[in-house]
């Protein structure tokens, strides 16, 4: 899964909008089997926060062992702590499960900083606040790890929701969601509403608060406002998409759109930040700095290292620009844009000194592995991972943090030519990007 700040926290050519409005295929998505508009039992089934990840409760084994599992659309293994660890309150005890089957195979997953390794097996898995089904799924029982589990995060494992191509040790290990769809009548689709609090939460507040919703098998219309706009999944490995244009406060960054997707652009709930390729990051920061130049920030702030603290209640949201990413649409030469606010890209951080400060870290960072649309982006939107139709949908989240003057937005259509040219073709010799 992508790294830096990656959870587990280890911390163009696109044409200008021409005012030409292309007709949408339909104004409303047709209702499909299993896609009813209400999934009450699944709403509010996530807890957590962007800096440490969002997790869902799952049960593993017989009798069921309850664990909190990080929801990660940037990886494809279901892996759980299976041995004592100082940061784990509980862990999967295979010896207590009558339905556990050992696959007699190990798995080793290194990251830039840290790693986990474990033993592969299968067991019965269900999601108490999910579909009323039990599936036999592959499980990596983590026996050793370094800088993987986070102290105080309250999750004990990771649910990789991406495709088999990036599963470890190889693509023959079926990911959980594939098993779920194969073994049940759950439609091949899930959607995520990640709700940033807009202020720092201490551990007890995280436990008591709602972090959002993972709707398995459908779309819940109460979780978003306006319309859902879809972008094609370019390739089924990560959830790869194509960005065709980037604007800061409506000003085009004017870069070759290939730069935005160099070497890929992915939607990843397991990454905290909006991560941008080096050239794009530098251009974006230059533009954001210029817009907010009335305040003197330390250099470390723009590197995500240094927090800044305004007197509580006086954060000058208005001096920070909105950021718009234009995504390839489903129709030829049509794009749409998603717009986030500083309330998304300035991440609230607890300042131990005093509750009378509002402290933030800059949550846009540099990447050497392409654009990563992490929690910073996802907290603005309801995101539909429509695997059946190979597309990802975005709508304004009903829980996004905003002020009285500006709101996150999903708008379109815009005419954008030659969008296919925005995609970067990774040379075939490339090994997995997991190590980058």
């Amino acid at each position: 899964t992508q790294h830096g700040i990656r959870l587990p926290l280890r911390s163009g050519l696109g044409g200008a909008p021409l005012g030409l409005r292309l007709p949408r295929e339909t104004d409303e998505e047709p209702e499909e089997p299993g896609r009813r508009g209400s999934f009450v039992e699944m709403v509010d089934n996530l807890r957590g926060k962007s800096g440490q990840g969002y997790y869902v409760e799952m049960t593993v084994g017989s009798p069921p062992q309850t664990l909190n599992i990080l929801v990660d659309t940037g990886s494809s293994n279901f892996a759980v702590g299976a041995a004592p660890h100082p940061f784990l309150h509980r862990y999967y005890q295979r010896q207590l499960s009558s339905t556990y089957r050992d696959l007699r195979k190990g798995v080793y997953v290194p990251y830039t900083q840290g790693k986990w390794e474990g033993e592969l097996g299968t067991d019965l898995v269900s999601i108490p606040h999910g579909p009323n089904v039990t599936v036999r799924a592959n499980i990596a029982a983590i026996t050793e790890s370094d800088k993987f589990f986070i102290n105080g995060s309250n999750w004990e494992g990771i649910l990789g929701l991406a495709y088999a191509e990036i599963a470890r040790p190889d693509d023959s290990l079926e990911p959980f969601f594939d098993s779920l769809v194969k073994q049940t009548h759950v439609p091949n689709l899930f959607s995520l509403q990640l709700c940033g609090a807009g202020f720092p939460l201490n551990q007890s507040e995280v436990l008591a608060s709602v972090g959002g919703s993972m709707i398995i098998g459908g779309i819940d219309h109460s979780l978003y406002t306006g319309s859902l706009w879809y972008t094609p999944i370019r390739r089924e490995w990560y959830y790869e998409v194509i960005i065709v244009r980037v604007e800061i406060n409506g000003q085009d960054l004017k870069m070759d759109c290939k730069e935005y997707n160099y070497d890929k652009s992915i939607v990843d709930s397991g990454t905290t930040n909006l991560r941008l390729p080096k050239k794009v990051f530098e251009a974006a920061v230059k533009s954001i700095k210029a817009a907010s130049s009335t305040e003197k920030f330390p250099d470390g702030f723009w590197l995500g290292e240094q927090l800044v603290c305004w007197q509580a209640g006086t954060t000058p949201w208005n001096i920070f620009p909105v950021i718009s990413l234009y995504l390839m649409g489903e129709v030829t030469n049509q794009s749409f844009r998603i717009t986030i606010l500083p309330q998304q890209y300035l991440r609230p951080v607890e300042d131990v000194a005093t509750s009378q400060d509002d402290c933030y870290k800059f949550a846009i960072s540099q990447s050497s592995t392409g654009t990563v649309m992490g929690a910073v982006i996802m907290e603005g939107f309801y995101v539909v991972f429509d695997r059946a139709r190979k597309r990802i949908g975005f709508a304004v989240s009903a829980c996004h943090v905003h002020d009285e003057f500006r709101t996150a937005a999903v708008e379109g259509p815009f005419v954008t030519l030659d969008m296919e040219d925005c995609g970067y073709n990774i040379p075939q010799t490339d090994e997995s990007t997991l190590m980058t």
């Epitope: 305040e295 920030f297 240094q306 603290c309 007197q311 509580a312 006086t314």
Partner: antibody, heavy 119, light 107 residues
Framework: EVHVKQSGPELKKPGETVTISCKAS????????MTWVRQAPGKDLEWMGW????????IYADDFKGRFAFSLETSAGTAYLQINNLKNEDTATYFC????????????WGQGTSVTVSS | DIVMTQSQKFMSTSVGDRVSVTCKAS??????VAWYQQKPGQSPKLLIY???TRHTGVPDRFTGSGSGTDFTLTISNVQSEDLADYFC?????????FGGGTKLELK
């Protein structure tokens, strides 16, 4: 131009109460917190705490909890420090300062108010 | 509490000299350090914040540097009006603390 002006020197007896005023001008008062710093003879500068001028909530350093109270008269752009039950060791110069916009550095200081406690 | 140590209580200099005042934090404070100048009978004046950012109106002969635990205030081309006490302060961690000061005097 930013100005921070404090009230004049005070001579008090042990057990009495003193109130120091600090009037700020030249900026939006409720945008910047006001901090209090003590400079006692022969001692380092001590951060006493600060008051959020937007919410009115005071924050005290551990050594200044109890007898010390920060307050505001927002409409007048004025902050106050009250010290109750004065002790000899409270003899010092008290400064009010505007806290920095992005952190607790202190960008504009009052001229200081000398408080002498003596029987 | 974080202790800010200014090991040199006094420093002697001459007009036109370059002088460096140092400050050491007892733990990592990032760049959350400010420097103040105080003349006798006056209140302190902010010179530098974020370890290296010059406050409005401060002459460019004053330069701050450092991060983590070691910080330096450098005055190049010392002027007679620079003879004063210099204090460092950390605002990384509650309670915010000051160094004991370094008095700059003429040789």
């Amino acid at each position: 131009e930013v100005h921070v002006k404090q009230s004049g020197p005070e001579l008090k007896k042990p057990g009495e109460t003193v109130t120091i005023s600090c009037k700020a001008s030249g900026y939006t008062f409720t945008t910047y917190g006001m901090t209090w710093v003590r400079q006692a003879p022969g001692k380092d500068l001590e951060w006493m705490g600060w008051i959020n001028t937007h919410s009115g909530v005071p924050i005290y350093a551990d050594d200044f909890k109890g007898r010390f109270a920060f307050s505001l008269e927002t409409s007048a752009g004025t902050a106050y420090l009250q010290i109750n039950n004065l002790k000899n060791e409270d003899t010092a110069t008290y400064f009010c300062t505007r806290r920095g916009r992005l952190g607790h550095y202190f960008d504009y200081w009052g001229q200081g108010t000398s408080v002498t406690v003596s029987s | 509490d974080i202790v800010m140590t200014q090991s040199q209580k006094f420093m002697s200099t001459s007009v036109g000299d370059r002088v460096s005042v140092t400050c050491k934090a007892s733990q990592n404070v990032g760049t959350n350090v400010a420097w103040y100048q105080q003349k006798p009978g006056q209140s302190p004046k902010l010179l530098i914040y974020w370890a290296s950012t010059r406050h409005t109106g401060v002459p460019d002969r004053f330069t701050g540097s450092g991060s983590g635990t070691d910080f330096t205030l450098t005055i190049s081309n010392v002027q007679s009006e620079d003879l004063a006490d210099y204090f460092c302060q950390q605002y990384s961690s509650y309670p915010y603390t000051f160094g004991g000061g370094t008095k700059l005097e003429l040789k």
